[in-house]
């Protein structure tokens, strides 16, 4: 059985303030069943950025339809970027359970924010 891979192809992304940022993430397998969540930061203090199941994420949308059968693209778009959004973002696969169990993280994508061109 091939090991699940969580692929974040870009090590870094630079976006002008006010623009949208797309953070790409794909998984190599539909198995095991379980959600993908996005976080900023890697330690215990990491911030939840997007969780399809529940939560309040007004500036974050899924690029593909995550409810679509056989979807393996879990990229997100963050709108109206500000300097406070800078940081390293991780796409993380969980195994469905009670609670869900963290399986594998992507390598992370560092988001940097440029000043808005005048």
């Amino acid at each position: 059985e091939e090991e699940l891979q969580v692929i974040q192809p870009e090590k870094s992304v630079s976006v002008a303030a006010g623009d949208s940022a797309t953070l790409n993430c794909t998984v190599s397998s539909l198995i095991p069943v379980g959600p993908i969540q996005w976080f900023r930061g890697a330690g215990p203090g990491r911030e939840l950025i997007y969780n399809l199941k529940e939560g309040h994420f007004p500036r974050v949308t899924a690029v593909s339809d995550p409810t679509k059968r056989n979807n393996m693209d879990f990229s997100i778009r963050i709108s109206n970027i500000t300097p406070a959004d800078a940081g390293t973002y991780y796409c993380v696969k969980f195994r469905k359970g009670s609670p869900d169990v963290e399986l594998k993280s992507g390598a992370g994508t560092e988001l940097s924010v440029r000043a808005k061109p005048s």
Epitope: F39, R40, G41, A42, G43, P44, G45, R46, E47, L48, I49, G55, H56, F57, G87, P99, D100, E102
Partner: antibody, heavy 117, light 108 residues
């Protein structure tokens, strides 16, 4: 505006229990790790415990096995159950919001716990 | 556990003078060091993070520097409202998150 309001402090005898609460508002509580930090009279702050956004818990060695941190995202409330209290647990207990890079960016006003026989 | 040692214990200066506070870590923390200000009866307030980045709303008279094990908080021109205790904190990814013992800044 972010607000954190602790409650539940008081005077107890050694060996007794207390449960602290922290009501949060002004931010999406479920998206952030939360922590308890205490400060004994005249001393510096001491990190006590943390609960992550996925409800994983972490404790300082000094409270491990005696204190339990938990969160109720539906109520935007953080808790600290403190059992087998000791005189050295006497302190002001603050709850704080943690940023993604492990900074304590907002603190409550604190609640005083006094353990004395 | 990383131990943070602050010096001096107390600093007594006049308004307009420059205050230099030191924090030394028992092992390297890279640039992951923060400074907090605490006034009597209040909770600590974040001033500086990542050694030299000012937190939102913090006046530019506060600046931080250093990396590895040796860090400095500088208040370029002391004002009366800067009278407080200042704590350093290492903010590497994993607990325990440790604080220094503090430096008390008194305004003469």
């Amino acid at each position: 505006d972010v607000q954190l309001v602790e409650s539940g402090g008081g005077v107890v005898r050694p060996g007794e229990s207390l449960r602290l609460s922290c009501a949060a508002s002004g931010f999406t509580f479920s998206n952030f790790a939360m922590t308890w930090v205490r400060q004994a009279p005249g001393k510096g702050p001491e990190w006590v415990s943390l609960v992550s956004v996925t409800a994983t818990t972490y404790y300082a060695d000094s409270v491990k096995g005696r204190f339990t941190i938990s969160r109720d995202n539906s109520k935007s409330t953080l808790y600290l159950q403190m059992n087998s209290l000791r005189a050295e647990d006497t302190a002001v207990y603050y709850c704080a919001k943690i940023t993604w890079n492990n900074l304590f960016d907002y603190w409550g006003l604190g609640t005083l716990v006094t353990v004395s026989s | 556990e990383i131990v943070l040692t602050q010096s001096p214990g107390t600093l007594s200066l006049s308004p307009g003078e420059r205050a230099t506070l030191s924090c030394r870590a028992s092992q390297t923390v890279g640039s992951k060091l923060a400074w907090y200000q605490q006034k009597p009866g209040q909770a600590p307030r974040l001033l500086i993070y990542d050694s030299s980045s000012r937190a939102s709303g913090i006046p530019d008279r506060f600046s931080g520097s250093g990396s590895g094990t040796d860090f400095t908080l500088t208040i370029s021109s002391l004002q009366s409202e800067d009278s407080a205790v200042y704590y350093c904190q290492q903010h590497n990814d994993w607990p325990p998150y440790t604080f220094g013992g503090g430096t008390k800044v008194e305004i003469k």
